[in-house]
């Protein structure tokens, strides 16, 4: 097992025996799971690929970065990691593509250090409200979390249960105002087709906000004007159509924000005028001149920067006597 | 209540393969997990693999490792046991069960099938 004079790159590994043999009492300092990797010098254990089914009970004191990815977890009970002497230095956990579709409350209870959770890459079907506040109360303890990334977190279609997917992470996420701290929120790849119009104003101290790759078609009902730290967002790769004036306002209005916009299927109407005359004069859209029209087909691969409003004509609606069939 | 149907047992030689079968009746969406557990003439009944409905995720008992697979198909509520290198000590009952927990013990499983033989011999 590792010493404390151990250099950070040099990884110690357990024998397989340790791990059942001492369970049951408090971690040795210098011990390592089975299955896993440690450093005492970097604070690092890494259990990564071994299909480890629970997370392991003899995880180090010391261990402030813990990688348990690749595993077959399938569920976080509650107080997953809850020891006793507590992992006070618990600082970056990352469960990415460990098979988790179960997240139950009070799973990251008793980790008062832990600032970034990653949970992407798995099916996680059935995520509790209170599996990041850990409690039901309507005011929970602030949790420590800074960085949550939650990107691919959506099960395949047919293993989804009958509910909101949206409304199921979006009361994670706000349940008992515990991550008012938050500052990086990545929610790509989700098939998101709206987001609900309470989550971003919850989330004051939000920098970073990533919504890319998902199926968001409008924001006409998401305000930004309660971000003021926003520094990017994220919106690359959605089925955005156009982006209305309250929306241009509120996102004019943040004093630090980047937006990312591309490769979405924006229509170029008469609708599209506010925003085209507004990218013009903005520079908080990144890579501006890439966006291009989607529809109609008369407009498709038209740069948006390079539109006036005479491009940009409705169809006259014909009163119903003059329709033909 | 979910019915559970194993099929697919019979005698094979050491060294030989079998794939048993489990069909669900319904999908049980209250049941997040399907197990084979096994039963040899006069001991109890010992858990062999677990598969997870959603995700996918799996997981043995030591002694099968390596040796065999579980797998589900969504589309047609069905768990199936993939078993090679058979032995002897392989032979016993097979039992289907589902049930809530992402557990080892006999106790995690609510509903059981009836069991299908496999038998190892020369």
């Known amino acids: 097992s590792s010493s404390p004079t151990s250099s950070a790159s040099s990884f110690s590994s357990s024998a397989p025996f340790l791990a059942s043999a001492v369970s049951a009492q408090p971690p040795l300092p210098d011990q390592c799971p089975a299955l896993c990797e440690c450093s005492e010098a970097a604070r690092t254990v890494k259990c990564v690929n071994r299909n480890l089914t629970e997370v392991p009970t003899d995880l180090p004191a010391y261990v402030r970065n813990l990688f348990l990815t690749g595993n077959q977890l399938a569920v976080l009970p509650a107080g997953a990691f809850a020891r006793r002497p507590p992992l006070a230095e618990l600082a970056a956990l990352n469960l990415s593509g460990s098979r988790l579709d179960e997240v139950r409350a009070g799973a990251f209870e008793h980790l008062p250090s832990l600032r970034q959770l990653d949970l992407s890459h798995n099916p996680l079907a059935d995520l509790s409200p209170f599996a990041f506040s850990g409690s039901n109360a309507s005011v929970s303890a602030p949790s420590p979390l800074v960085e949550l990334i939650l990107n691919h977190i959506v099960p395949p279609e047919d293993e989804r249960q009958n509910r909101s997917f949206e409304g199921m992470v979006v009361a994670a996420l706000l349940a008992g105002r515990a991550l008012q701290g938050l500052r990086r929120l990545e929610l790509a790849s989700n098939h998101f087709l709206y987001l609900p119009r309470d989550v971003l104003a919850q989330l004051p101290s939000l920098r970073h906000l990533d919504l890319s790759n998902n199926s968001l078609v409008s924001l006409t009902y998401v305000s930004f004007r309660n971000l003021t730290h926003l520094e990017s967002l994220h919106l690359e790769d959605n089925a955005l159509k156009v982006l209305h004036n309250g929306t241009l306002a509120e996102l004019q209005g943040l004093p630090h924000i980047r937006v990312f916009l591309d490769n979405n299927p924006w229509v170029c109407d008469c609708h599209m005028a506010d925003m085209v005359t507004w990218l013009k004069e903005t520079e908080v859209v990144q890579g501006k001149d890439r966006l291009t029209c989607a529809y109609p087909e008369k407009m498709r691969n038209r740069v948006l920067l390079e539109l006036n409003s005479a491009d940009l004509d409705c169809d006259p609606i014909l009163p119903p006597s003059l329709q033909t069939s | 209540e979910v019915q559970l149907v194993e099929s697919g047992g019979g005698e094979v030689q050491p060294g030989g393969s079998l794939r048993l079968s489990c069909a669900a009746s319904r999908r049980p969406f209250s049941s997040k997990t399907m197990a084979w557990f096994r039963q040899a003439p006069g001991k109890e009944r010992e858990f062999v693999a677990a598969?997870?409905?959603?995700?996918?995720?799996?997981r043995y008992t030591e002694s099968v490792k390596g040796r065999f697979t579980i797998s589900r198909d969504n589309a047609k509520n069905t768990v199936y046991l993939q078993m090679s290198s058979l032995r002897a000590e392989d032979t016993a009952v097979y039992y289907c069960a589902a049930g809530q927990a992402w557990g080892t013990k006999f106790t995690d499983y609510s509903d059981w099938g009836q069991g299908t033989l496999v038998t190892v011999k020369p």
């Open positions: 598969v997870r409905w959603i995700g996918g995720a799996t």
